[in-house]
């Protein structure tokens, strides 16, 4: 007996790791046996070379060759997402549409977010080598190498957190050249080599000498970003100071720094960072768009000298280095609601003054943009006709608009009755795909 098509096996999300073809499965029942066609982001696929897709007789889709690891177009950020694939099974009694399956490709960018820096540590004290691995998909794992060999991590003495290496108690044998290595299925990347010097603690019989040291912090200068640290490095400053008093009793110098609070406000706690220098040194890990106070403190072993004077420096704002998160589109009564969550705080690069929202061309909205001022994280757009509505959102600081979110789309059906929401075992679909062809 004749029956309409029904999807029995839906395609599954997968990561293309190559070098062989990726396969997307789709099986359907129906009488007469249905014909299968595949769509990518709602558009039918050609399957004829030079198309990178090939259809097998059983309805399986072969992706013969992915794009070069990660792809970008129209000036957008590198993407790992090849798109959402759906299959359609059709016979003369109707058409069934599968759930969408997202295909992504393994990527590992070149640029480290934070490169490890040369440093001086003291025997018995803890020190940290910072490393922010390059962005990658899947998330890269981080390992450390010392003097060209993998570092054997000793529990209780070594901890790797977020890529950074924390050494609980420095020993003379820890001296050497360290490198951070990020690895995922797309390959591996090596950081710059950082030189770690270990000094013996010096016990002064008269630590009172340290109290007589006077430190004049003379300059705090914003450094030009190191190109090796990639396109969005955290800011670093160069501190210069002069020491007077007893003959060089200080064994090391520590920078103390904090963000400046509003006048009369409770001061923020001072952060401390051991400096690799005796008259000048680099201090990193700061944030754009902040006003900082800096001072320097001398120390010898456990003894500390008096703090220097305080210098202020305003770091300029930059555009946000991450897009707004969780962008969603929801249908309203003759309107579409766009909502989002601000980018992570560490990517603000200043004060977020508002948001820019774009509608993309070739959908039911003409290309347009709106500015949302202040802390508001939603926008209502009037709609006049059914069709696809696609938007992108970017956060704005005093330096301009930052990285835009990936396009998010919503299909409004006839008479604005409802938005197409394809059920799945994971609840409704994310609204990231254009589903103009998913009408029953």
């Amino acid at each position: 007996q004749d029956s309409p098509p029904q999807i029995l096996v839906h395609p599954q999300d997968q990561l293309f790791q190559g070098p062989g073809p990726a396969r997307m499965s789709c099986q359907a029942s129906g009488q007469p046996p249905p014909t299968i066609r595949w769509l990518l982001n709602g558009q039918p696929l050609s399957m004829v070379p030079p198309d990178p897709h090939h259809l097998l007789p059983d309805g399986t889709l072969l992706l013969l060759q992915p794009p070069a690891r990660g792809h970008a177009h129209d000036g957008q950020a590198l993407s790992t997402d090849l798109g959402v694939y759906t299959c359609e099974a059709s016979n003369r009694l109707g058409t069934a549409v599968s759930r969408g399956a997202r295909l992504s490709v393994a990527v590992l960018r070149e640029d480290f977010q934070i490169q490890p820096r040369d440093m001086v540590a003291v025997v018995g004290e803890q020190f940290t080598l910072e490393c922010g691995p390059p962005w990658g998909h899947p998330e890269p794992t981080v390992s450390w190498w010392k003097d060209g060999k993998p570092l054997a991590l000793q529990p209780g003495r070594h901890t790797v957190s977020g890529g950074s290496l924390l050494m609980a108690r420095a020993e003379k044998s820890d001296e050497g050249t360290y490198m951070c290595v990020a690895t995922n299925s797309a390959g591996h990347r090596e950081s710059r080599a950082a030189r770690v010097s270990i000094q013996e603690p010096q016990d002064y019989t008269e630590p009172v000498e340290l109290l007589a040291v006077r430190i004049q912090l003379e300059n705090v200068t914003l450094l030009n970003p190191d190109p090796a640290e990639g396109p969005k490095p955290r800011p670093a400053v160069w501190l210069s100071w002069k020491v007077s008093g007893p003959a060089a009793p200080a064994q090391s110098y520590t920078a103390l720094f904090r963000t400046q609070t509003a006048p009369g406000g409770q001061g923020a706690p001072w952060a401390e960072e051991l400096l690799a220098g005796w008259q000048s040194a680099e201090l990193g890990g700061l944030h754009w768009g902040q006003d900082y106070e800096f001072k320097v403190r001398p120390s010898s072993g456990r003894a500390r000298g008096p703090d220097s004077n305080v210098l202020l420096l305003r770091l300029p704002e930059k555009v946000p280095s991450a897009p707004p998160q969780e962008v969603t589109l929801k249908p309203g009564n003759g309107t579409v609601f766009v909502s989002w969550v601000p980018p992570p705080a560490e990517n603000h690069n200043g004060i977020i003054r508002g948001y820019q929202v774009w509608s993309l061309g070739n959908t039911s909205l003409p290309p347009a943009n709106w500015t949302v001022v202040g802390e508001q994280t939603q926008l209502e757009i009037a709609t006049h006709m059914p069709g696809s509505y696609c938007v992108q959102v970017a956060a704005v600081t005093g330096a301009g608009a930052g990285e835009p979110s990936r396009p998010v789309c919503l299909l409004l059906e006839q008479a604005m009755e409802r938005a197409t929401q394809e059920p799945s075992e994971h609840g409704p679909w994310t609204l990231e795909q254009l589903r103009a062809t998913l009408k029953r």
């Epitope: 990518l40 696929l45 050609s46 004829v48 794009p67 061309g361």
Partner: antibody, heavy 123, light 107 residues
């Protein structure tokens, strides 16, 4: 910098042969299709042939089938168009172009073009 | 073979004008359509592929739309450097075919 450079054009008599070369640099040659496209003087663009650097798959326009042969040497990152039995109507500027696939909205574009090489078939 | 028909074959416009060129395929080609710009004596330059995605480095005043058989290239505000000939091309099936071209001239 991604670049394609054609060479080998010139004046040839009807019935004669020429071999055009297209040297690619700045990208992974085997990951892309290369097309030859020609343009007769004062006319529009006409696709001639395509080859896939990865596996050597080829396709031809009916107007050149049996007379032209496309090939590639991946070790030299170079594509070739061997043109035999040339006719007056083959006179044109011949371009080689790299074909890229767009993933957000499926389809191809010839995103990198050579400067073109003129082939004149005349007695 | 899939025939690609462009209209108009030529048009005159002024700097700042909004210009629309259409391309019709003789059968459905999904989004497998590209647009090129060509200036005299130069190789063509890719503007749009996948019907609506701008190629790298192409100004945002160029946009493409359409799917199936009917496609449009729009230049939102014509600039002096935009006077050229524009071609559409399908890659849905062999033979790959181009439209006959649209020449955009200064009024």
């Amino acid at each position: 910098e991604v670049q394609l450079v054609e060479s080998g054009g010139g004046l040839v008599q009807p019935g004669g042969s020429l071999r055009l070369s297209c040297a690619a640099s700045g990208y992974t040659f085997s990951s892309y299709w290369i097309s030859w496209v020609r343009q007769a003087p004062g006319k529009g663009l006409e696709w001639v042939s395509t080859i896939y650097g990865y596996d050597g798959s080829t396709n031809y326009a009916d107007s050149v089938k049996g007379r032209f042969t496309i090939s590639a040497d991946t070790s030299k990152n170079t594509a070739y168009l061997q043109m035999n039995s040339l006719r007056a109507e083959d006179t044109a500027v011949y371009y080689c172009a790299r074909m890229s696939y767009n993933w957000s909205s499926p389809g191809h574009g010839m995103d990198v073009w050579g400067q073109g090489t003129l082939v004149t078939v005349s007695s | 073979d899939i025939q690609m028909t462009q209209s108009p074959s030529s048009l005159s416009a002024s700097v700042g004008d909004r210009v629309t060129i259409t391309c019709r395929a003789s059968q459905s080609i999904s989004s497998y359509l590209a647009w090129y710009q060509q200036k005299p004596g130069k190789a063509p330059k890719l503007l749009i592929y996948g019907a609506s995605s701008r190629a790298s480095g192409v100004p945002s005043r160029f946009s493409g739309s359409g799917s199936g058989t009917d496609f449009t290239l729009t230049i939102s505000s014509l600039q002096p450097e935009d006077f050229a000939t524009y071609y559409c091309q399908q890659s849905w099936s062999y033979p790959l075919t181009f439209g006959q071209g649209t020449k955009v001239e200064i009024k």
